[in-house]
């Protein structure tokens, strides 16, 4: 008999696809960074699987990830942020698959917040402002933002505006009168650091005034 089935779990594991994706978030909790990974196949059996990162770390050779449901993550100050780290999926001491990744190229910024819209009656426009925690950060400071807005009744007709500042002006004549709008914003690294879009900010809702409305007041949120 062949020894192929002697360690069924491990042999089965070797037949599976353990490809995974990760993103980093720098200074996400004070000076702590985080790294989050997940298997690309959400149905993979993760019971005995662990993640480990080695290399490009400060003071230690390797670090183990914590597990939350199907997510693996680390929060640490020990990322060197220079050079590539080796991230491996392991069963016990055996590595099933590894990836060499520069953590500065897989950065996902934190979501913008405090999004608001103020109507200026005299100027016939709407001033959109929002905040980002990255203005206070040491590393990922420069971002490109994607502001998306739609008339609430138009399920998937989003208009997108890209900008590098945290302020945008929308002209009243470009919007429908007496209509409800939803607006949201997300961010992506735009200088030195590379990576992915942040989560969307919470949506903000505003109503445009009637064309002949002299007060022009918006419902405050």
């Amino acid at each position: 008999e062949s020894g192929y089935a002697q360690n069924g779990d491990l042999e089965d594991a070797e037949l599976d696809d353990y490809s995974f994706s990760c993103y980093s978030q720098l200074e996400v909790n004070g000076s702590q960074h985080s790294l989050t990974c997940a298997f690309e196949d959400p149905d993979v059996n993760i019971t005995n699987l662990e993640f480990e990162i080695c290399g490009a770390l400060v003071e230690v050779k390797c670090l183990n990830f914590r597990k939350l449901q199907e997510i693996y993550f680390i929060e640490t100050k020990k990322f060197l942020l220079i050079g590539k780290s080796n991230i491996c999926v392991k069963v016990g001491e055996k590595s099933l698959t590894c990836k060499k990744i520069d953590l500065t190229t897989i950065v996902k910024p934190e979501a913008p917040f405090d999004l608001s819209v103020v109507y200026r009656e005299g100027a016939n426009d709407f001033v959109v402002t929002f905040n980002t925690s990255h203005l206070q950060k040491k590393y990922v400071k420069v971002l490109m933002h994607d502001v998306a807005y739609r008339q609430e009744k138009d399920e998937n007709k989003w208009t997108h505006v890209n900008l590098s500042s945290t302020k945008l002006t929308l002209l009243q004549r470009k919007l429908q009168p007496a209509a409800m709008y939803e607006i949201k914003v997300r961010s992506i690294p735009d200088h030195y650091f590379k990576g992915f879009w942040s989560e969307w900010s919470p949506s903000y809702y505003f109503r445009t005034p009637e064309i002949n409305n002299s007060s022009g007041e918006m419902d405050p949120i």
């Epitope: 996400v28 909790n29 989050t36 939350l68 449901q69 199907e70 997510i71 979501a111 989560e199 969307w200």
Partner: nanobody
Framework: QVQLVESGGGSVQPGGSLRLSCATS????????MTWYRQGPGKTRELVAV???????TYADSVKGRFTISRDNAKNTMDLQMNGLKPEDTAVYYC???WGGGLNRAPFDYWGQGTQVTVSS
């Protein structure tokens, strides 16, 4: 299709408390951001509270110190404990679960049907 179901709404006197819950019928990805919004009579929908997968919370100024948002990732549920309720808290409360995409998971944006909260003496 994932469904979100809110519960816990009702009528209460000023100063009273209610606890809203939001449960999902399907498996919600752990990294999703969970949010409570509300819409009062004749008003636009507004943010009440947000909780990220990491447990970071954000509140609207009008509810700070009175409302507490929490979540249970193992059960895919979110709660909103509302204390010191005021008449101006009267609204339909909606839960929202969002994931912007990444890690080979498609983006999603799910909304509940809403639960009515009425604060009146």
């Amino acid at each position: 299709q994932v469904q979100l179901v809110e519960s816990g709404g009702g009528s209460v006197q000023p100063g009273g408390s209610l606890r809203l819950s939001c449960a999902t019928s399907g498996s919600i990805f752990s990294l999703a951001t969970m949010t409570w919004y509300r819409q009062g009579p004749g008003k636009t929908r507004e943010l009440v509270a947000v909780i990220t997968w990491r447990g970071t919370t954000t509140y609207a100024d009008s509810v700070k110190g009175r409302f507490t948002i929490s979540r249970d990732n193992a059960k895919n549920t979110m709660d909103l404990q509302m204390n010191g309720l005021k008449p101006e808290d009267t609204a339909v409360y909606y839960c929202n679960v969002k994931w912007g995409g990444g890690l080979n998971r498609a983006p999603f944006d799910y909304w509940g049907q809403g639960t009515q909260v009425t604060v009146s003496s």
